[in-house]
């Protein structure tokens, strides 16, 4: 951090490495919960027109797809991978792509993914073929 920028104690709005370099925040789709038509597809676009700067540099992009008897929703947010989201750990937070994984939730079908490239939660991937380690 340059000397004229104040350092603040216990501040999670800034992440620095040992050399004082500053980590950028993620750019993520951030429409909270919206109704969705994404169903029975290998991948879907979020149809979220809002790309936000995540509040904290450690946050990653998250997408949550839910289906019950009444509707399908897609949630797009930023979230800190050190904290659970919907009671689940974000295991794939370092992935450049948002690969959906099913989670057990009573009364609904629930998929969640997280990723750490800009706007990576705009394209959510359900297809098994992406679930192997893919460099890009």
């Amino acid at each position: 951090i340059p000397p004229h920028v104040q350092k603040s104690v216990n501040n999670d709005m800034i992440v620095t490495d040992n050399n004082g370099a500053v980590k950028f925040p993620q750019l993520c789709k951030f429409c909270d919960v919206r109704f969705s038509t994404c169903d029975n597809q290998k991948s879907c676009m979020s149809n979220c027109s809002i790309t936000s700067i995540c509040e904290k540099p450690q946050e990653v992009c998250v997408a949550v797809w839910r289906k019950n008897d009444e509707n399908i929703t897609l949630e797009t947010v930023c979230h800190d991978p050190k904290l659970p989201y919907h009671d689940f750990i974000l295991e794939d937070a370092a992935s450049p792509k948002c690969i959906m994984k099913e989670k057990k939730k009573p009364g609904e079908t629930f998929f969640m993914c997280s990723c750490s490239s800009d706007e990576c939660n705009d394209n959510i991937i359900f297809s098994e073929e992406y679930n192997t380690s893919n460099p890009d």
Partner: nanobody, 124 residues
């Protein structure tokens, strides 16, 4: 030598407007994503807005969405921030910064140079 020089700060009443400028030199302006970042007294950095080098795609923090507008003039190597409907909580030193180009997924993209900042005070 790389230089970023912010200007346009000052004292403004709540609900008022200000336009900040950042004059850039010493690097190829059109190769960099540019940012406005602010720091309120005794607080940490807050990431306010960013703009892509070409095509002028813009991004905002949720706290300023709809009130602030970032823009750039590549012919003048200048970055701008139009701030409307200002609130007391917008009081801060505003810095412009450039992001080192790199792959988008890289987790360690960094600021390599900072300006000295311009103080914005919103008070009645």
């Amino acid at each position: 030598e790389v230089q970023l020089l912010e200007s346009g700060g000052g004292l403004v009443q709540p609900g008022g407007s200000l336009r900040l400028s950042c004059a850039a030199s010493g690097f190829t302006f059109t190769e960099y994503r540019m940012w406005w970042v602010r720091q309120a007294p005794g607080k940490g950095l807050e990431w306010v807005s960013a703009i892509e080098p070409i095509g002028n795609r813009t991004y905002y923090a949720r706290s300023v969405e709809g009130r602030f507008t970032i823009s750039r003039d590549n012919s003048k190597n200048t970055l701008y921030l139009q701030m409307n409907s200002l609130r007391a909580e917008d009081t801060a030193v505003y810095y412009c910064a450039k992001q080192i180009p790199g792959r988008k997924w890289t987790a360690n993209s960094r600021f390599d140079y900072w300006g000295q900042g311009t103080l914005v005070t919103v008070s009645s």
